[in-house]
C-alpha cells in the first residue's frame, strides 16, 4: 500500500492519522511541514525544534515515499561531523547507506533535500526553505 | 496555519487528521494519493472510483497549500464542457476564477495538475500519473 | 568552551527572587540553545527550560516551573540568564547552565561549574 | 510529560566487571537517547547521545543499545575512574527528563 500504487486496490479500513501540530501533513502517521520562509540550517533546526519537531530525517524510502513527490531544495536534519568523517541525523543516528544518493553542491556541512531522495550539501549558512518533521510512531 | 507558515508558532494542540484510506496523506482533513502508474483520465477516473474517491479537485488555495510542493504532472478531475465551454470538476462544479492558471498544453479536454496551481490542457486518452483524493469534511 | 558557572548564587529568602547569569565561550553561543539544568541535594536532575541563542526568540520551559522563572539571553554578549522569582524552601538546590546541542539528541554537552541556591529563612 | 525510569538504582562491582544499566522510556523515544556521567561534587558529563554514538574522548570500553522505550549502557570493563553516578535522559520532545540514576559503587 505505497504512496505510488502500482495496483490499484479498495482499502479494507479508513484510519485518522497520528497525531500532529494542528495543519501539518500527516502520511503513515508521520507529521510533516514545510516552511517557505528561508532560513540558515540553524535557524531551521531551531524553528522546528520551537515546535517540538525536528527537520526533516530520511529513515525509510517506504514509509516516506511521499518525499519523492516534492519539489524543489528544503534543509533537512543532516549534518557532517567533521571529526570522524560522518553524515548525522540530529537524534544521533548515522545516515544509512543508500536511502540518500549525496550530491556535492557546495563545499559545506549541511545538506538540502531534494525530490526523489537526494540530498544536496551546502553550506550551513545560506538561506532555505526547510522541512520540519514530527515522528509519531 | 498553512503549511507554508510565515511565523512559527508552537501548536496549542495536537490532532488526528482523517480518517482516510490506509496509507493515504491527510492534510486538512483532506485525503490525497498520488499513483504513480499511468492511466488515461478515464481509466484513473475509475480507480480513484474505486477506492471511494475522486480525481483530484482543486477548490482552495489556502486548505490544499500542500499542492504547491507537487513536482511532475498528474490527472485531476477537471473535464472541458465543450458545450458551453466551462471547465468543470466531477461533481459537477465549476472551476473558479483565480484558482488554477490553465495553460494549453495540448488540444484536449482534460487537465494536468502541475505545482503552484498550474492546470495544463492534455488530450484525456494520454497515460500519465494522477492524483486521488477523498474529502472528509 | 564554557566558562562560568552562573553568577549570582547564594543564600536567598523564601518569597525572594534571584538572577543567575552564565557567559559562553569558545563557541558560536548563536547556533546553540541555553539550557539550565537543577540538581537537588542528594537528588537527581530536572530541566528548567530552553532558550535559543540565536535571532528567533524560541523559549520552552517545564510545566512545573508555572511562570515563576524567566529566562533570558544577550547575544551580543554571549550571555543566559535565569530569573527566579517566589522561590521556596523546595527551590534549593545546584543550578547549571548548560549548553544544548540540538544536533546531538538534544543532549547537553557543556555544563558550567554550577551555583548552590539556598532559599532559608 | 515522558518519564524515564532506571535500573537498577544502584550497582556494586569491582574493576574489570561488566555493567549494565538499563533505561526505560513511558513512551517510545526512537533514539533520542542520552547517557551522562556525573562523579560527587561535580558537574554531570555527556557520554553518549543518540543511545550509542560516544562523545569524543569516551571511552571505548563505553557502549549503548536499543531504541523506542528500552535502552541499555554497559561498561565491558569497569575502571576506578569509571565509578560515579550515572543518569539518562530524553532528548525527543519538551520537556526533557532524566532518569533518577544509576549509582555504580565499588564493591
Known amino acids: 500500500n505505497s504512496l505510488f500504487n502500482q495496483e490499484v486496490q479498495i482499502p479494507l479500513t479508513e484510519s485518522y492519522c497520528g497525531p500532529c501540530p494542528k495543519n501539518w501533513i500527516c502520511y503513515k502517521n508521520n507529521c510533516y511541514q514545510f516552511f517557505n520562509e528561508s532560513k540558515n540550517w540553524y535557524e531551521s533546526q531551531a524553528s522546528c525544534m520551537s515546535q517540538n519537531a525536528s527537520l526533516l530525517k530520511v529513515y525509510s524510502k517506504e514509509d516516506q515515499d511521499l518525499l519523492k513527490l516534492v519539489k524543489s531544495y528544503h534543509w533537512m536534519g543532516l549534518v557532517h561531523i567533521p571529526t570522524n568523517g560522518s553524515w548525522q541525523w540530529e537524534d544521533g543516528s548515522i545516515l544509512s547507506p543508500n536511502l540518500l544518493t549525496i550530491i556535492e553542491m557546495q563545499k559545506g556541512d549541511c545538506a538540502l533535500y531534494a525530490s526523489s531522495f537526494k540530498g544536496y550539501i551546502e553550506n550551513c549558512s545560506i538561506p532555505n526553505t526547510y522541512i520540519c518533521m514530527q515522528r509519531t510512531v | 496555519n498553512s503549511l507554508f507558515n510565515q511565523e512559527v508558532q508552537i501548536p496549542l494542540t495536537e490532532s488526528y487528521c482523517g480518517p482516510c484510506p490506509k496509507n493515504w496523506i491527510c492534510y486538512k482533513n483532506n485525503c490525497y494519493q498520488f499513483f504513480n502508474e499511468s492511466k488515461n483520465w478515464y481509466e484513473s477516473q475509475a480507480s480513484c472510483m474505486s477506492q471511494n474517491a475522486s480525481l483530484l479537485k482543486v477548490y482552495s488555495k489556502e486548505d490544499q497549500d500542500l499542492l504547491k510542493l507537487v513536482k511532475s504532472y498528474h490527472w485531476m478531475g477537471l473535464v472541458h464542457i465543450p458545450t458551453n465551454g466551462s471547465w468543470q470538476w466531477e461533481d459537477g462544479s465549476i472551476l473558479s476564477p483565480n484558482l488554477l492558471t490553465i495553460i494549453e498544453m495540448q488540444k484536449g479536454d482534460c487537465a494536468l495538475y502541475a505545482s503552484s496551481f498550474k492546470g495544463y490542457i492534455e488530450n484525456c486518452s494520454i497515460p500519465n500519473t494522477y492524483i486521488c483524493m477523498q474529502r472528509t469534511v | 568552551e564554557q566558562s562560568g558557572g552562573g553568577a549570582g548564587g547564594g543564600l536567598v529568602k523564601p518569597g525572594g527572587s534571584l538572577e543567575l547569569c552564565c557567559k559562553a565561550?569558545?563557541?558560536?553561543?548563536?547556533?546553540?540553545?541555553m539550557s539550565w539544568v537543577r540538581q537537588s541535594p542528594g537528588k537527581g536532575l530536572e530541566w528548567i527550560g530552553r532558550i535559543y541563542g540565536g535571532s528567533s526568540d524560541y523559549t520552552a520551559y517545564a510545566s512545573w516551573v508555572n511562570g515563576r522563572f524567566t529566562l533570558s539571553r544577550d547575544i551580543d554578549q554571549s550571555t543566559g540568564c535565569l530569573q527566579l522569582n517566589s522561590l521556596t524552601a523546595a527551590d534549593t538546590a545546584m543550578y547549571y547552565c548548560?549548553?544544548?546541542?540540538?544536533?546531538?539528541?538534544?543532549?547537553?554537552?557543556?555544563w558550567g561549574q554550577g551555583t548552590l541556591v539556598t532559599v532559608s529563612s | 510529560d515522558i518519564q524515564m525510569t532506571q535500573s537498577p538504582s544502584s550497582v556494586s562491582a569491582s574493576v574489570g566487571d561488566r555493567v549494565t544499566i538499563t533505561c526505560r522510556a513511558s513512551q517510545g523515544i526512537f533514539s533520542w537517547l542520552v547517557w551522562y556521567q556525573q562523579k560527587p561534587g561535580k558537574a554531570p558529563e555527556l557520554l553518549m547521545y543518540?543511545?550509542?554514538t560516544l562523545q569524543s574522548g569516551v571511552p571505548s570500553r563505553f557502549s549503548g543499545s536499543g531504541s523506542g522505550t528500552d535502552f541499555t549502557l554497559t561498561i565491558s570493563s569497569l575502571q576506578p575512574e569509571d565509578f560515579a553516578t550515572y543518569y539518562c535522559?530524553?532528548?525527543?520532545?519538551?520537556?526533557?527528563?532524566f532518569g533518577q540514576g544509576t549509582k555504580v559503587e565499588i564493591k
Open positions: 548548560v549548553r544544548l546541542n540540538p544536533s546531538f539528541s538534544r543532549s547537553f554537552d557543556y
Open positions: 535522559q530524553q532528548g525527543y520532545s519538551t520537556p526533557y527528563t
Open positions: 543518540g543511545a550509542s
Open positions: 565561550s569558545g563557541f558560536d553561543f548563536s547556533i546553540y540553545w
